[in-house]
């Protein structure tokens, strides 16, 4: 059977007027997954993004991550889109005081 | 001009399955996901899932797992919501909707479904 | 999930008065919230999403504030083309999830 992924979206301070975004996916099964910002709805070019190794995680389970750098105050127009195993789910950037965004997509 | 054109109003009886048509115009329908909310009188609106077209990857509703499936054809820029065995809470007004990012822009103009014996 | 809660559930104002409409999260949706106009019949149209920023061709007298988890929508100088359902949605999380609504009835 398929183990379904945790997401989680960080932002960290990258340059003056900009953040990083990243998405990590983790303790999913199998290997096989879809990770990727999308603006407005679209997904981004490859070049714009950077991706991670699919890696296990030690527990039979894979992991992964997708960044990309967008304009502070824009966060809002940015999804991290996760496919796996026939499903997606999308998550959004957090704001500013708060790290981090859980989803144990089912 | 985006467009999402649903097909007409449906009475079908207890026990059976209907399937709901969007049809996309105006933008790239690949591109974007569809999202599927029922309406019923006086109960307010429930989001039942979405599709990616281009992939045929979905996320539902815990409440319509067993209820719905969600379909896509890119050939014909239209996506599908099918309900099977069919009851009297099932009537409804079914809209689909794109997702931009992280609201929907532009809704069909609804889908009746009237379950009735 | 999210549990959306709006208030008030119906109003009645004149033409030109000010009203407004609240939406309160059981969580923090992180400004991740739409609201939607619904006449009679009609599929809804959006007014405001991430909770400020107005919607394309949608008059200035409309007008979304909030963070965390209250939220709020108001109509400066009601106009009669106004009156219909209003509700809000939330984006934080799936499955999204919708206010109650608010019927606004002109006077």
């Known amino acids: 059977g398929s183990v379904p992924p945790m997401v989680n979206v960080t932002r960290s301070e990258a340059s003056e007027g900009n953040i990083t975004v990243t998405c990590r996916a983790s303790s999913f099964y199998p290997r096989n997954i879809t990770l990727t910002w999308r603006q407005d709805g679209v997904s981004l070019s490859h070049d714009t993004q950077q991706w991670g190794d699919v890696l296990p995680d030690g527990n039979g389970t894979y992991q992964t991550w997708v960044a990309t750098r967008i304009c502070q105050g824009e966060e809002q127009r940015f999804t991290c889109y996760m496919e796996h195993s026939g499903n997606h789910s999308t998550h959004p950037v957090p704001s500013g005081n708060s790290h981090h965004h859980h989803h144990h997509h089912h | 001009q985006v467009q999402l054109q649903q097909s007409g109003a449906e009475l079908v009886r207890p026990g059976t399955s209907v399937k709901v048509s969007c049809k996309a115009s105006?933008?790239?329908?690949?591109?974007?996901?569809i999202e599927w909310v029922k309406q019923r009188p006086g109960q307010g609106l429930e989001w039942i899932g979405a599709?990616?077209?281009?992939?045929?990857?979905?996320n539902y509703n815990e409440k319509f797992k067993d209820k719905a499936r969600l379909t896509a054809d890119k050939s014909s820029n239209t996506a599908y919501l099918q309900f099977s065995s069919l009851t009297s809470d099932d009537s409804a007004v079914y809209f689909c909707?794109?997702?931009?990012?992280?609201?929907?822009?532009?809704w069909g103009q609804g889908a009746t479904l009237t379950v009735s014996s | 999930d999210i549990q959306m809660t709006q208030s008030p559930a119906s109003l009645s104002a004149s033409v030109g008065e000010t009203v407004t409409i609240t939406c309160r999260a059981s969580g923090n949706i992180h400004s991740y919230l739409a609201w939607y106009q619904q006449k009679q019949g009609k599929s809804p149209q959006l007014l405001v999403y991430y909770a400020e920023t107005l919607a394309d061709g949608v008059p200035s007298r409309f007008s979304g504030r909030g963070s965390g988890t209250q939220y709020s929508l108001k109509i400066n100088s009601l106009q009669p083309e106004d009156f219909g359902s209003y509700f809000c949605q939330q984006f934080w999380t799936t499955p999204y999830t919708f206010g109650g609504g608010t019927k606004v009835e002109i006077k």
């Open positions: 599709i990616n077209p281009g992939s045929g990857a979905t």
């Open positions: 909707a794109r997702f931009l990012g992280n609201y929907f822009d532009n």
């Open positions: 105006g933008y790239a329908f690949t591109n974007y996901l």
